[in-house]
């Protein structure tokens, strides 16, 4: 118990003056407070909590549900405090079957003992299944038993509390651990497409898909060199355990030319952020260009074989294109093919292969390419020696 | 790290009494779980007692309870045990162990990190 020491406030003192009391149940709890300026005692065990305002507690028939801390508090602020364990053979364990665990971090089994004379109080699984080797525990009878460290793959680990009596192991109600995976990586971030070029009232729409071990990454779209907030919306799964995935998905509904610029979308948990862009371009309207790979005027001998080739850009894409030697079509010696699969493509070449030459073929070949907004030609100018 | 010392072995009589100890030094004050393993000749280190440091849970196997008590004193950073009715067959070497924490299988001597040297205790008959 404490000692006083004159002029300045002290705890207040407790009866009976032990830091525990064993009691059995049915029993009385008689606990006395004295204080000149007692406040309340409070009861607390597990996550309940229960005051009294007279200084002397008295429970006439203890139950095992009685076990816990009693605190008694003076004016001051001061408290001191006596923990009672109501002996029920019936009822071994005070049980919260709430358990969740951070990965790497302690979590405490909350299975306090209402007997702490028991012995070997400990874990057990479920249904005689082992516990996994490397499983630590520090156990205490008013708390309950701290697993130590909480490893991944602990997570849906069925667990008892455990002890020995009278030489036969009791178990108390099942626990299922639930572990929140730690961040040991930043997020994995990916983007539907790399760019994208529209035409002004076309829709935009890009997907992010982050992935990480919890749904509590944080991810949004922003704008480069704007605060802006953008209109985003998310679907996400959880494929199986610690494998999250969400997709945020941007849409603008009808692009601007204003609206072109960088897109990105950014990701971060504690352990580190991650981001990938996206390039929108808009143009007022689509456009044709086209790049000569050879020379427009061209030199040939007679009987010798000549390629005009062309590249172009095309935006959207190219639906009629045709070569012509006066005024009549090709209809073979030519082939057009887009200059790389990438769906985002817009450069294509177009070859008009020339054979054997005669002098008479001289003249202008021309390329002609039409989409749905514009034309475009290009001429060459062929001399036969 | 932690030093573990035992003493209060030696030679009894069967039916007689004897009490170890085991004094804890270094970075004790992280090892919350203290244990008595034994082993005798020619046989698989067994387990004998273990308490827990700040909570005060003591575990035994069913063989040795009653016969045996663990007990603490952290004033002292010393553990005890005291042996009863002793017999024949608990002549062996006992050793103390501890770690920070209990594994899920306590009586598993593989799974404590820190070991005594070992004290003989031997029962006459």
């Known amino acids: 118990q404490p000692s006083v020491s004159p002029g300045e406030p002290s705890p207040p003192s407790i009866h009976p003056g032990k830091s525990d009391l064993i009691v059995r149940v049915g029993d009385e709890i008689r606990l006395l407070c004295t204080d000149p300026g007692f406040v309340k005692w409070t009861f607390e065990i597990l996550d309940e909590t229960n005051e009294n305002k007279q200084n002397e507690w008295i429970t006439e028939k203890a139950e095992a549900t009685n076990t816990g801390k009693y605190t008694c508090t003076n004016k001051h602020g001061l408290s001191n405090s006596i923990y009672v364990f109501v002996r029920d053979p019936a009822k071994l364990f005070l049980v919260d079957r709430s358990l969740y665990g951070k990965e790497d971090n302690d979590t405490l089994v909350r299975c306090p003992l209402t007997d702490p004379e028991v012995t070997n109080y400990s874990l057990k699984g479920c249904q005689g299944k082992p516990l996994p080797k490397d499983l630590r525990f520090i156990p205490d009878p008013k708390a309950g038993i701290m697993i130590k460290s909480v490893k991944r793959a602990y997570h849906r680990l069925c667990l008892h509390c455990s002890v020995d009596q009278e030489g036969k192991s009791v178990l108390s109600e099942k626990f299922i651990l639930k572990v929140r995976p730690a961040f040991k990586a930043v997020p994995v971030v990916s983007v539907s497409k790399a760019s994208y070029l529209l035409r002004e009232g076309e829709e935009f729409t890009v997907t992010c898909t982050i992935k990480d071990v919890s749904s509590s990454v944080y991810s949004t779209w922003k704008r480069e060199n704007s605060q802006t907030k953008l209109q985003e919306k998310y679907n996400s799964w959880h494929h199986g355990d610690f494998n999250y995935e969400r997709q945020a998905t941007l849409t603008i509904s009808s692009a601007r030319v204003n609206d072109s610029g960088v897109f990105m979308c950014y990701a971060n948990n504690t352990f580190g952020s991650a981001n990938v862009t996206t390039t929108l371009e808009v143009v007022d309207k689509g456009f044709i260009n086209i790049f000569p790979m050879i020379n427009t005027t061209v030199f040939v001998n007679d009987g010798e074989n000549v390629d005009l080739i062309v590249e172009y850009e095309a935006f959207p894409k190219p639906e009629h294109q045709q070569w012509i030697y006066m005024n009549r079509t090709f209809t073979d010696k030519w082939e057009d093919y887009p200059k790389s699969e990438n769906e985002s493509n817009i450069r294509y070449v177009s070859e008009l292969h020339l054979t054997r030459l005669k002098g008479t073929e001289g003249g202008t070949y021309t390329f002609l390419v039409s989409n749905s907004d514009v034309n475009a030609a290009i001429a060459f100018n062929v001399y036969v020696n | 790290e932690v030093q573990l010392v035992e003493s209060g072995g030696g030679l009894v009589r069967a039916g007689g009494s004897l009490r170890l100890s085991c004094a804890a030094s270094g970075r004790t004050f992280t090892y919350d779980a203290r244990a008595w393993f034994r082993q005798a000749p020619g046989k698989e280190r067994e387990f004998v007692a273990a308490?827990?440091?700040?909570?005060?849970?003591?575990y035994y196997p069913n063989s040795m309870k009653g016969r045996f008590t663990i007990s603490r004193d952290n004033a002292k950073n010393t553990v005890y045990l005291q042996m009863n009715s002793l017999k024949p067959e608990d002549t062996a070497v006992y050793y103390c162990?501890?770690?920070?924490?209990?594994?899920?299988?306590?009586?598993?001597?593989?799974?404590?990190?820190?070991w005594g040297q070992g004290t003989l205790v031997t029962v006459s008959s």
């Open positions: 162990a501890a770690d920070e924490s209990f594994p899920a299988y306590y009586s598993d001597y593989a799974l404590y990190r820190y």
């Open positions: 308490i827990s440091w700040s909570g005060g849970s003591t």
